[in-house]
Amino acid sequence: YNNFRKSMDSIGKKQYQVQHGSCSYTFLLPEMDNCRSSSSPYVSNAVQRDAPLEYDDSVQRLQVLENIMENNTQWLMKLENYIQDNMKKEMVEIQQNAVQNQTAVMIEIGTNLLNQTAEQTRKLTDVEAQVLNQTTRLELQLLEHSLSTNKLEKQILDQTSEINKLQDKNSFLEKKVLAMEDKHIIQLQSIKEEKDQLQVLVSKQNSIIEELEKKIVTATVNNSVLQKQQHDLMETVNNLLTMMSTSNSAKDPTVAKGEQISFRDCAEVFKSGHTTNGVYTLTLPNSTEEVKAYCDMEAGGGGWTIIQRREDGSVDFQRTWKEYKVGFGNPSGEYWLGNEFVSQLTNQQRYVLKIHLKDWEGNEAYSLYEHFYLSSEELNYRIHLKGLTGTAGKISSISQPGNDFSTKDADNDKCICKCSQMLTGGWWFDACGPSNLNGMYYPQRQNTNKFNGIKWYYWKGSGYSLKGTTMMIRPAGF
């Protein structure tokens, strides 16, 4: 028991040696930095951890084992001392007692000593077994952590190489970005130059436009003057013709019949030999009141008096009863000829009405009514239509029987509402009905889903606002 050594072997394991009489006990313990804690027992098939556990637990565990070993050693030494003391006492007694008792006493003492030694040996064997168990466990843990460390080292190496790659890529991209920035700056400069050039060009164009506008104004004035001159010339020619017809009536009566000073409609203008499209002055028989109307001398044989035209939204059609009565707008552009004139004209002889329509997709259609007339103002210029043909719907988009004319200040429709106010413009509204060619003018891409647009239901449906419309009349027998 008196020989106890602690040393390190060649492979770095702690060596404990206990001398017990002729027996010598040697314990080889691994030099461990990390042991599994007692609270988490070792499981042989457990999944290996990616990272080792904290090392402190293992160190503490080893220290506990060392303390146990030292305690056991001290205990054994105490036992040895105690046995020696007992042996001394017993030797003295033996010497004092009679020789005959010596053998028996010796046997008894020997037996006691053997029993005690056997008991200690058993305890020591248990401790040894425990230590070996723990050692095996620690060795397995060490192996596991060693593997985990290797795996981590490999991962670190992989990550390091990955980082290096990314750094290379990053520097490459940085170079590329710098190059692109340079390119971008150059492009921006060229764009700026182009912009400056364009601005110069725009200012030039603006000045040109201003000049052109001035020229247009001048031309318009000149045109008006020319039209007046033409009108005066026409009157002079008509006067001359009248004078000639009066002086020559006996010689050639047909000349007097063929020439007229005024025309009631474009059919008469056409028949008089004027076959060019344009604005003409019309006068009703037995009337001095003149109206300017556009005559279409080409479409369907010519002679058409245009009573309404929509083409660009340049004229406001949300007008009063009086304005719709006498007419408004520009006869060579958007206009309304006038309900009074049309009413009087269509009540003198039978007229046909042709309505020509254009949509925003380049399509055209028409509705032709073989008989058309308007009632007098007393009957609110009620529309009368018969005999529909054409491509703009098999059903009439002007309600049948005809309705009274309504304007924003004269509500003659069949709706609780005021259709003219709801849908804008003057029209022969029902409640409010399938058409309104005097509605709001909407440009392309804004012309759908409109309550108050230029509508011809049986061609384009309820929400579609048309691009262009022309309403024209001509005597039925033309």
């Epitope: 709706c415 609780i416 509402c417 005021k418 106010q421 709801m422 409640a431 409010c432 009905g433 399938p434 889903n449 409109k450 309550f451 108050n452 509508k455 239901y457 049986y458 384009k460 449906g461 309820s462 929400g463 579609y464």
Partner: antibody
Framework: QVQLVQSGAEVKKPGSSVKVSCKAS????????MVWVRQAPGQCLEWMGY????????GYNQKFEGRVTITADESTSTAYMELSSLRSEDTAVYYC??????????????WGQGTLVTVSS | DIVMTQSPDSLAVSLGERATINCKAS??????VAWYQQKPGQPPKLLIY???TRDTGVPDRFSGSGSGTDFTLTISSLQAEDVAVYYC?????????FGCGTKVEIK
């Protein structure tokens, strides 16, 4: 009597489409426009669009443009509303309704019973 | 789009008393306004159109008024069966739009 009967409730996944039907009876199907209105939980009523069964003309609320398609089958007097690219916000009760006037999309005098469409992943 | 703002959001009125619901349009809608009644689990029902015209079969205790931007629905003598949500609707321009509703309850 005038009646609009809609198809049953639907549960749909986000990104999919739903097609709701509305069968009309008791009146001439082509004489009136048909509209679709939806009502999301705790939200206002929202007009989606209309169809004119007479000529197939349609009009849509710009909010749904490109996602909603309204069609009509004159032979069965049925209108359909298909909504695509569904998202959770499309969870709502969808109603079909008849307009009082053929020529204009005025007020709505007859309504279907509604179809609940739930959009959930 | 035209915004229709209803007020109040909810209204508690005693039986037989007058209930008044207001609706304000963000722009002039003339008289193109309708009112609907919606009871739980049911579709809306047309009550008034053209701001003041009662639909067929609607009791005369319901009346509508207004033009331009301000409109009112009045229930002159509230009945138990009038408990519902009421919506205003403009159809003056596309897209037609609705108010968000006024809940009418009995006090």
């Amino acid at each position: 009597q005038v009646q609009l009967v809609q198809s049953g409730a639907e549960v749909k996944k986000p990104g999919s489409s739903v097609k709701v039907s509305c069968k009309a009876s008791g009146y001439s199907f082509t004489d009136y426009n048909m509209v679709w209105v939806r009502q999301a939980p705790g939200q206002c009523l929202e007009w989606m669009g209309y169809i004119d069964p007479y000529n197939g003309g349609t009009g849509y609320n710009q909010k749904f443009e490109g996602r909603v398609t309204i069609t009509a089958d004159e032979s069965t007097s049925t209108a359909y509303m298909e909504l695509s690219s569904l998202r959770s916000e499309d969870t709502a009760v969808y109603y079909c309704a008849r307009t009082r006037d053929r020529y204009d999309v005025w007020y709505f005098d007859v309504w279907g019973q509604g179809t609940l469409v739930t959009v959930s992943s | 789009d035209i915004v229709m703002t209803q007020s109040p959001d909810s209204l508690a009125v005693s039986l037989g008393e007058r209930a008044t619901i207001n609706c304000k349009a963000s722009q002039d809608v003339y008289i193109a306004v309708a009112w609907y009644q919606q009871k739980p689990g049911q579709p809306p029902k047309l009550l008034i159109y053209w701001a003041s015209t009662r639909d067929t079969g609607v009791p005369d205790r319901f009346s509508g008024s207004g033009s331009g931007t301000d409109f009112t629905l009045t229930i002159s003598s509230l009945q138990a069966e009038d408990v519902a949500v009421y919506y205003c609707h403009q159809y003056s321009s596309y897209p037609p739009t609705f108010g968000c509703g006024t809940k009418v309850e009995i006090k």
